[in-house]
Interface confidence: low
């Protein structure tokens, strides 16, 4: 059998790895870079030609409990005169993140990783026009 | 940690907060998400603040591939298809949680890591600083 390529290091288990029951994995939820902060331009959600609002969703059985979602304010985009131009479209930009879900089954508790799709903001795009014959 | 409502009939030994270390199922919930933004939409090309997507791969992380957006222009694309420097293309950044293998190379032992990614770009009116 060939030696696995460098990209396959995932499958070479060092002796120091902690024992883990089959079908599960050990997860330390003490976050690395916990205090990192977003350094986006100021108030871009209001200054954008495709402005958006933020909503905070809160779930006590999720870690982290708070997830912030953006919603585009308009269908169209804001032009130089400050008016909505419906010949252009405001569209959401989305990104996946991971959360830990805590599940209660009777008195027992289990944990599950979950992919969450977060809308992070909006951008202004030229619409795709479908011509009907 | 965060407080968890508990079944009042359960014994009191359960911690109300998330423990520091948990055992989680290997399967990740939610199949409706698409990890490759190039396949999920062409907004990066159609935007008035278009961006390029750069592949960031790290086998010690899950997901191992993350796409980073870089705005193509300082300005925005106007109706004529030219760059208008009276407006600015700026990145939209987001903190996301990923899994970092800890200890390194271990198949089933991870730690949550917060990373900052640029997801796309948006066109904004610039902040003009008037000098007295």
């Amino acid at each position: 059998r060939k030696i696995p390529k460098v990209g396959h290091t995932f499958f070479q288990k060092p002796e120091s790895c902690p024992p883990v029951p089959g079908g599960s994995m050990k997860l330390d939820i003490g976050i690395i870079n916990e205090n990192q902060r977003v350094s986006m331009s100021r108030n871009i959600e209001s200054r954008s030609t495709s402005p958006w609002n933020y909503t905070v969703t809160w779930d006590p059985n999720r870690y982290p409990s708070e997830v912030v979602q953006a919603q585009c304010r308009n269908l169209g985009c804001i032009n130089a005169q400050g008016k909505e131009d419906i010949s252009m479209n405001s569209v959401p930009i989305q990104q996946e993140t991971l959360v830990v879900r805590r599940k209660h089954q009777g008195c027992s508790v289990s944990f599950q990783l979950e992919k969450v799709l977060v809308t992070v903001g909006c951008t202004c795009v030229t619409p795709v026009i479908h011509h009907v014959q | 940690g965060i407080t968890i409502p508990r079944n009042p009939g359960c014994p009191n030994s359960e911690d109300k907060n998330f423990p520091r270390t948990v055992m989680v199922n290997l399967n990740i919930h939610n199949r409706n998400t698409n990890t490759n933004p190039k396949r999920s939409s062409d907004y990066y090309n159609r935007s008035t603040s278009p961006w390029n997507l750069h592949r960031n791969e790290d086998p010690e992380r899950y997901p191992s591939v993350i796409w980073e957006a870089k705005c193509r222009h300082l300005g925005c694309i106007n109706a004529d298809g030219n760059v208008d420097y009276h407006m600015n293309s700026v990145p939209i950044q987001q903190e996301i949680l990923v899994l970092r293998r800890e200890p390194p190379h271990c198949p089933n032992s991870f730690r949550l890591e917060k990373i900052l990614v640029s997801v796309g770009c948006t066109c904004v009116t610039p902040i003009v600083h008037h000098v007295a």
Epitope: F10 | N30, Y62
Partner: nanobody
């Protein structure tokens, strides 16, 4: 788009063997895998093989009992299942995926066959 067709499922007694096949047509892929879903349970990873055939990966629950392989042309993948147990009863799916990291993540498989039923009686 990859088309996948599984075969070889059936009813077998505990301790018996079955060989599943998965015929693939279409574009290339980084890995192919077998996944299964028992009634009322989550779909779970069983085994995977890299596109080159050099590397194979197994779930702990089947290690030593199941063997994944593919033909030289890379068109057909097999799952040889020995020492079958009642808990192996499930619909078995073959699927393709991009990338070889975290092959156990069932979400990252892109193309799925229609599934073949495996029933192990005690």
């Amino acid at each position: 788009e990859v088309q996948l067709v599984e075969s070889g499922g059936g009813l077998v007694q505990a301790g018996g063997s079955l060989r599943l096949s998965c015929a693939a047509s279409g574009r290339t892929y980084d890995a192919m895998g077998w996944l299964r879903q028992a009634p009322g349970k989550e779909r779970e990873f069983v085994a995977a093989i890299s596109g080159s055939g050099d590397d194979t990966y197994y779930a702990d629950s089947v290690k030593g009992r199941f063997t994944i392989s593919k033909d030289n042309a890379g068109i057909t993948m097999y799952l040889q299942m020995n020492s079958l147990k009642p808990e192996d009863t499930a619909v078995y799916y073959c699927a393709t995926r991009r990338g070889l990291y975290y092959v156990w993540d069932t979400n990252d498989y892109e193309n799925w066959g229609q599934g073949t039923q495996v029933t192990v009686s005690s």
